[in-house]
């Protein structure tokens, strides 16, 4: 699996789990929430060269498209596969509210 | 939807359904297919700028965190979402075969 | 610059619903929390609740529990307000609000121009 | 929820005259060494305008002789010469509790 136990151990150019803090106040410009202050996102990008983790028949018809033409612009893309939500605290006016925010962690990536 | 109806209409430079024509033989190297001799298989391609059919939170904080920092390289990335079988015909010697190949067609985009 | 541009007035009848709309541009629409304000003829100003369009968290005005529903369209940068089960006494001006941006529950800076909502039989 | 008072309801005034407007809240508003409270001016037919927040900071383009001030429960809104557009509707508002309430507004008229 392309995950921070594969890809945070190994120096990988193509399609791979790549390490992102968000900082709320400073990266998305939200300053409302009270914790946690920012997360590790993390990110997917890379190379989907042929048969590199590929997620569906299309994406292998895709790198195998591309094998063949290599100058076509026609080519899977890297992203992300299991995501996990974060809990996020913050206040309406004195009153704590504690949150689920769903998908907001990238924990394995995909040729798609 | 990002799919035919709308960017094949539509000259459009963000993620948009593509349209990529597949011949078996020239483009795959498959030469056991019968029918078809080839499908359209198009494909997802095109920028993926802040809410543009955003798939997932995470996308979302991606979409945005590009737009607050353009530098970053972490972005989201048009990829399919609606994948569609094909039925092709081949021979086991002179007995033919029909069989539906899964996820071949792509119907729609997304930025994930 | 900010801009808040709401949908234009309503004629209702009691036990309908209406859904306002409130289309934002010059800023990005993820960020911000968006309240809605009503005013009663001659009367003063009643919160009845916000939504985060990002993740579609809302806090509702318990006054207006079950009969109101927040929800946006980030593709087109719109919130909209929906309000079931009218009575005369809903008969107001409709206003969407952005929020300042520090807190969840917070003044509001940029308001939209207002929707006249008459419910009468 | 917070019930928030003001007055006068409605007071007279000259153009160059000072006024003050009061909000009392039926609790303290004050947390985190903030004071949430806030003021906005309406005209008729428009909607209303954010002129103080947190009490005493004055909303970007508001001119300096609108001023607030207060703590805990008691707060005021102070015009420091009173100009003829000046003539509104003013309200406050606490969001130091759910739900954000106002106060019933105080009407300035020309004398």
């Known amino acids: 699996a392309l995950d921070a136990a594969y890809c945070f151990r190994n120096v990988q150019d193509n399609c791979c789990l790549r390490p992102l803090y968000i900082d709320f106040k400073r990266d998305l410009g939200w300053k409302w929430i009270h914790e946690p202050k920012g997360y590790n996102a993390n990110f997917c990008a890379g190379a989907c060269p042929y048969l590199w983790s590929s997620d569906t028949q299309h994406s292998r018809v895709l790198s195998l498209y591309n094998t063949i033409n290599p100058e076509a612009s026609a080519s899977p893309c890297c992203v992300s596969q299991d995501l996990e939500p974060l809990t996020i605290l913050y206040y309406i006016g004195k009153t704590p509210k504690i949150e689920q925010l769903s998908n907001m962690i990238v924990k394995s990536c995909k040729c798609s | 939807a990002l799919d035919a109806a709308y960017c094949f209409r539509n000259v459009q430079d963000n993620c948009c359904l593509r349209p990529l024509y597949i011949d078996f033989k020239r483009d795959l190297g498959w030469k056991w297919i019968h029918e078809p001799k080839g499908y359209n298989a198009n494909f997802c391609a095109g920028a993926c700028p802040y809410l543009w059919s955003s798939d997932t939170q995470h996308s979302r904080v991606l979409s945005l965190y590009n737009t607050i920092n353009p530098e970053a390289s972490a972005s989201p990335c048009c990829v399919s979402q609606d994948l569609e079988p094909l039925t092709i015909l081949y021979y086991i010697g002179k007995t033919p075969k029909i069989e539906q190949l899964s996820n071949m067609i792509v119907k729609s985009c997304k930025c994930s | 610059q900010v801009q808040l541009v709401q949908s234009g007035a309503e004629v209702k009848k009691p036990g309908a619903s209406v859904k306002v709309s409130c289309k934002a541009s010059g800023y990005t629409f993820t960020s911000y929390w968006m309240n809605w304000v009503r005013q009663a003829p001659g009367q003063g100003l009643e919160w009845m609740g916000q939504?985060?369009?990002?993740?579609?968290?809302?806090n509702y005005n318990e006054m207006f529990e079950g009969r109101v529903t927040m929800t946006t369209d980030t593709s087109t940068s719109t919130a909209y307000m929906e309000l079931r089960s009218l009575r005369s006494d809903d008969t107001a001006v409709y206003y969407c609000?952005?929020?300042?941006?520090?807190?969840?529950?917070?003044?509001?800076?940029?308001w939209g121009q207002g929707t006249l909502v008459t419910v009468s039989s | 929820d917070i019930q928030m008072t003001q007055s006068p309801s409605s007071l007279s005034a000259s153009v160059g005259d000072r006024v003050t407007i009061t909000c009392r809240a039926s609790?303290?508003?004050?947390?985190?060494?903030?004071?949430?409270m806030h003021w906005y001016q309406q005209k008729p037919g428009k909607a209303p305008k954010l002129l103080i927040y947190l009490a005493s900071n004055l909303e970007s383009g508001v001119p300096s002789r609108f001023s607030g001030s207060g703590s805990g429960t008691d707060f005021t809104l102070t015009i420091s010469s009173l100009q003829p557009e000046d003539f509104a509707t003013y309200y406050c508002?606490?969001?130091?509790?759910?739900?954000?309430?106002f106060g019933g507004g105080t009407k300035v008229e020309i004398k």
């Open positions: 609000a952005r929020g300042i941006g520090n807190y969840a529950l917070d003044a509001m800076d940029y």
């Open positions: 508002q606490q969001n130091a509790e759910d739900p954000l309430t």
């Open positions: 609790e303290s508003v004050d947390f985190w060494g903030n004071s949430f």
């Open positions: 939504i985060f369009p990002f993740s579609g968290s809302t």
